[in-house]
Amino acid sequence: APVRSLNCTLRDSQQKSLVMSGPYELKALHLQGQDMEQQVVFSMSFVQGEESNDKIPVALGLKEKNLYLSCVLKDDKPTLQLESVDPKNYPKKKMEKRFVFNKIEINNKLEFESAQFPNWYISTSQAENMPVFLGGTKGGQDITDFTMQFVSS
């Protein structure tokens, strides 16, 4: 069966939107009005992995781009990157480990934990216009909570 996907945007709990910053990086900043069109639209795919009521394994691709968020070790540190893939082969039900995030729903907020690096989360900074990154702390200065807005295909 083909993998099930939906299109969405994400905003952090401070209402910052995610936009492209160069070819292989996302940044978070406040957008208003027509600028909202700059925000990236994700194709969220529901992939194979350990699942529970509040935890669902997903892959986060950029809609109509052959780019996926992936988590790899760089200089011994878990790192978030945008990785290009062959569009003929993706998305797929069995994604490589580095592409898988556990989408965790808590109090109407979403967290995205790396399946490859447990307790590391997609994060944004309090500051404006900073890169989206993989953070190893929750409940500190950095933001790990998001809301999801559905986008029609």
């Epitope: 070790l73 580095r98 490859q116």
Partner: antibody, heavy 120, light 107 residues
Framework: QVQLVESGGGVVQPGRSLRLSCAFS??????????VGWIRQAPGKGLEWVAH???????SYADSVKGRFTISKDNSKNTVYLQMNSLRAEDTAVYFC????????????WGQGTLVTVSS | DIQMTQSTSSLSASVGDRVTITCRAS??????LSWYQQKPGKAVKLLIY???KLHSGVPSRFSGSGSGTDYTLTISSLQQEDFATYFC?????????FGQGTKLEIK
């Protein structure tokens, strides 16, 4: 230091089953990011990745063995298994187990291998 | 599946020679490439990972380079113990695939 030792190989008839074991020491397969794979080498041929299991139980298989082979682990025994059913002549090979950490995989430590011969 | 091609199946060289072994992927593998050495009766050894990173304990005469689809293993000055078979492995996409191997023989 890390050691991996394969066992369970032998001569088996086509269609029959065999279970290989990979006993390891020097690391724990409950450590996050850890993985063990099975790789085989047919006589006089190159290496072929067969199956892999991550610390969290996530499994992957080569198309050539999907539905016939099953990889599993027993953390308390520090052992990874490869259950091979419906064996075919083309499964004849030396089977190695190897350890990696994280995806993308680099197989850091390898066992010496165990020979499986499928023949009537 | 991604095909990995080591176009030279065997290579003759002498001690002290500089040797390069190549591996070509059927698509871009994002530098997710490792190199292995195999000797008869010995455990396979990891030499290079992530295209160019030298695994601990591997002599510095071994080096790796490449990007996209084309990758190279170089031995700067061949030693007696380097005569072996060398394999590349791509980790970009499941199923992970090896090259067919290049056997390095004494000239």
């Amino acid at each position: 230091q890390v050691q991996l030792v394969e066992s369970g190989g032998g001569v088996v008839q086509p269609g029959r089953s065999l279970r290989l074991s990979c006993a390891f020491s020097g690391f724990s397969l409950s450590t996050s990011g850890m993985g063990v794979g099975w790789i085989r080498q047919a006589p006089g041929k190159g290496l072929e990745w067969v199956a892999h299991i991550w610390w969290d139980g996530d499994e992957s298989y080569a198309d050539s063995v999907k539905g016939r082979f099953t990889i599993s682990k027993d953390n308390s025994k520090n052992t990874v298994y490869l259950q091979m059913n419906s064996l075919r002549a083309e499964d004849t090979a030396v089977y190695f187990c190897a350890r990696n950490r994280y995806d993308p995989p680099w197989f850091v430590d390898w066992g010496q291998g165990t020979l499986v011969t499928v023949s009537s | 599946d991604i095909q990995m091609t080591q176009s030279t199946s065997s290579l003759s060289a002498s001690v002290g020679d500089r040797v390069t072994i190549t591996c070509r992927a059927s698509q871009d593998i994002s530098n997710y490439l490792s190199w292995y050495q195999q000797k008869p009766g010995k455990a396979v050894k990891l030499l290079i990972y992530y295209t160019s990173k030298l695994h601990s304990g591997v002599p510095s005469r071994f080096s790796g380079s490449g990007s996209g689809t084309d990758y190279t293993l170089t031995i700067s000055s061949l030693q007696q113990e380097d005569f072996a078979t060398y394999f590349c492995l791509q980790g970009k996409m499941l199923p992970w695939t090896f090259g067919q191997g290049t056997k390095l023989e004494i000239k």
